[in-house]
């Protein structure tokens, strides 16, 4: 029950997370203009990362598209690249995490599948989040940086007589939405992946077999990939997960890609 | 077709109150910032005050601000100027505008007298 | 508060005649985000209310005859009457629509000669 609740509390975490990345890449306030410390205009500017936009105080508002591609600084392009690949990589998890939910039967899917289907959508989540985040932060990183830039030489004179005011700007609302939806995939990705270790069965579906070989008596004993004598093929046995709590013993057991997460 | 028409205007003495209105038609007044502008007998234009649409932010010429309140009621087509503590040098014709592309102030109403004299 | 020196303060002039009169402000009306000149010019004729003739220093306003036009950058700028008009007398103000307070300059009157 515990492990259905984060499974899908984990989903549910994701997709706001997700649909907040989308929301945030598609939002025209990245950068908007700085009114601390500066002439009030009847003007305000503000930038996303497909357009700019001018806010004027008639209420008239003009968006023109970053329509050259080759001209548009490196560093907003890597910006696009990572949020692009956050949505991308955040809309395959969310397909898959879809499939892999506890609550959904879909054929005769075993859970050592869904467990699979879990890790592989909570791992697409993390990265998701981190591409968002990173996004974000180096859109941030280059604010900042002209942001001072332009404090620097705020006014530039000409002639000591004609002034020429430089737009100085700051975080957008978009920086914040990016940063909370990034972080919300990571923790939903987190969480899928936390579930994904309680997701494989707990005990065997089958009866202990005996097997007879000439001066042999070989007994399979029910417990993860153990059999009283070290040969015999184990093909026909199901893998089964023991949720990492092993005797010493058991030290010989075959590790299963769910136990690193 | 646009229309703005002032009215409150009249003679009042040093350090009245007086409150102008400014009735709007021909234009989807909501979505529209308005102002008040002003001219003295035989001086320049003198912008007083605007107010956005909106969340209705507010605009004032410094010699003004205190003492005048620009505010609208969207559900009347209405704007208002308030203006208390008159001075002499407030003497002028009020004019109520709307504002365009550019901030251009595109309509005009007549106007109405505004006289502070003792 | 932006100052706005408009020159010459008049003029007189025949039908006919080309026209142009210049508007200085003391800082840049130019808007970076949109590569935008806030300056507006009106005309005002005695016992009338302003009509806006150009904004965005260049843009004219609908209705404006097309002897109407505006130029410059910055902080010049300039109206043009390309073929003055007896109904053309008027005072023509330019104004500053970028930063608050708005402000006007005091006037270029036009007179017939």
């Known amino acids: 029950m515990a492990v259905t609740a984060c499974q899908g509390l984990g989903f549910v975490v994701s997709l706001i997370g997700i649909a907040g990345i989308i929301a945030a890449t598609c939002m025209d306030q990245w950068s908007t203009q700085d009114l601390y410390n500066n002439p009030v205009t009847a003007v305000f500017n503000y930038q996303g990362l497909w357009r700019s936009c001018v806010r004027e105080s008639s209420g008239f508002t003009e968006c023109r598209g970053y329509f050259t591609l080759l001209g548009l600084p490196a560093m907003l392009q890597a910006v696009r690249a990572l949020m692009i690949v956050g949505i991308v990589l955040g809309a395959i998890g969310l397909l898959v995490s879809i499939f892999a939910l506890k609550c959904i039967r879909i054929g005769s899917m075993e859970d050592s599948a869904k467990a699979n289907m879990t890790l592989t959508s909570g791992i697409m989540f993390i990265v998701s989040g981190l591409c968002a985040i990173a996004g974000v932060s180096v859109f941030a990183n280059m604010l900042v940086t002209n942001f001072w830039m332009s404090t620097a030489n705020m006014y530039t004179g000409m002639g000591g007589m004609v002034q020429t005011v430089q737009t100085r700007y700051t975080f957008g609302a978009a920086l914040f939405v990016g940063w909370v939806a990034g972080g919300l995939t990571l923790i939903g990705g987190v969480m899928m992946c936390i579930a994904c270790r309680g997701l494989a069965p707990e005990e065997t579906n089958y009866k202990a077999v005996s097997y007879h070989a000439s001066g042999h008596s070989v007994a399979y004993k029910p417990g993860g990939f153990k059999a009283s004598t070290g040969f015999g093929s184990n093909t026909k046995n199901k893998k089964i997960y023991d949720g990492g709590a092993r005797t010493e013993d058991e030290v010989q057991s075959y590790p299963s890609k769910h136990d690193y997460v | 077709e646009v229309q703005l028409v002032e009215s409150g205007g009249g003679l009042v003495k040093p350090g009245g109150s007086l409150r102008l209105s400014c009735a709007a038609s021909?234009?989807?007044?909501?979505?529209?910032?308005v102002s008040w502008v002003r001219q003295a007998p035989g001086k320049r234009l003198e912008w007083v005050a605007t107010i956005t649409s909106g969340v209705s932010y507010t605009y004032y010429l410094d010699s003004v601000r205190g003492r005048f309140t620009i505010s609208r009621d969207n559900a009347k087509n209405s704007l208002y100027l308030q203006m208390n503590s008159l001075r002499a040098e407030d003497t002028a014709v009020y004019y109520c505008?709307?504002?365009?592309?550019?901030?251009?102030?595109?309509?005009w109403g007549q106007g109405t007298s505004v006289t502070v004299s003792s | 508060d932006i100052v706005m020196t408009q020159s010459p303060s008049s003029l007189s002039v025949s039908p006919g005649e080309r026209v142009t009169m210049s508007c200085k402000s003391s800082q840049s009306l130019l808007n970076s985000g949109n590569q935008k000149n806030y300056l507006t010019w009106y005309q005002q004729k005695p016992g009338q209310p302003p009509k806006l003739l150009i904004y965005?220093?260049?843009t004219r306003e609908s209705g404006v005859p097309d002897r109407f036009s505006g130029s410059g950058s910055g902080t010049d700028f300039t109206l043009t009457i390309n073929s003055f008009q007896a109904e053309d007398v008027a005072v023509y103000y330019c104004q500053n629509d970028y930063f608050y307070p708005l402000t006007f300059g005091a006037g270029t009157k036009l007179e017939l000669k």
């Open positions: 965005w220093a260049s």
């Open positions: 021909g234009f989807t007044f909501s979505n529209s910032a």
């Open positions: 505008t709307r504002q365009f592309k550019g901030n251009a102030l595109d309509y």
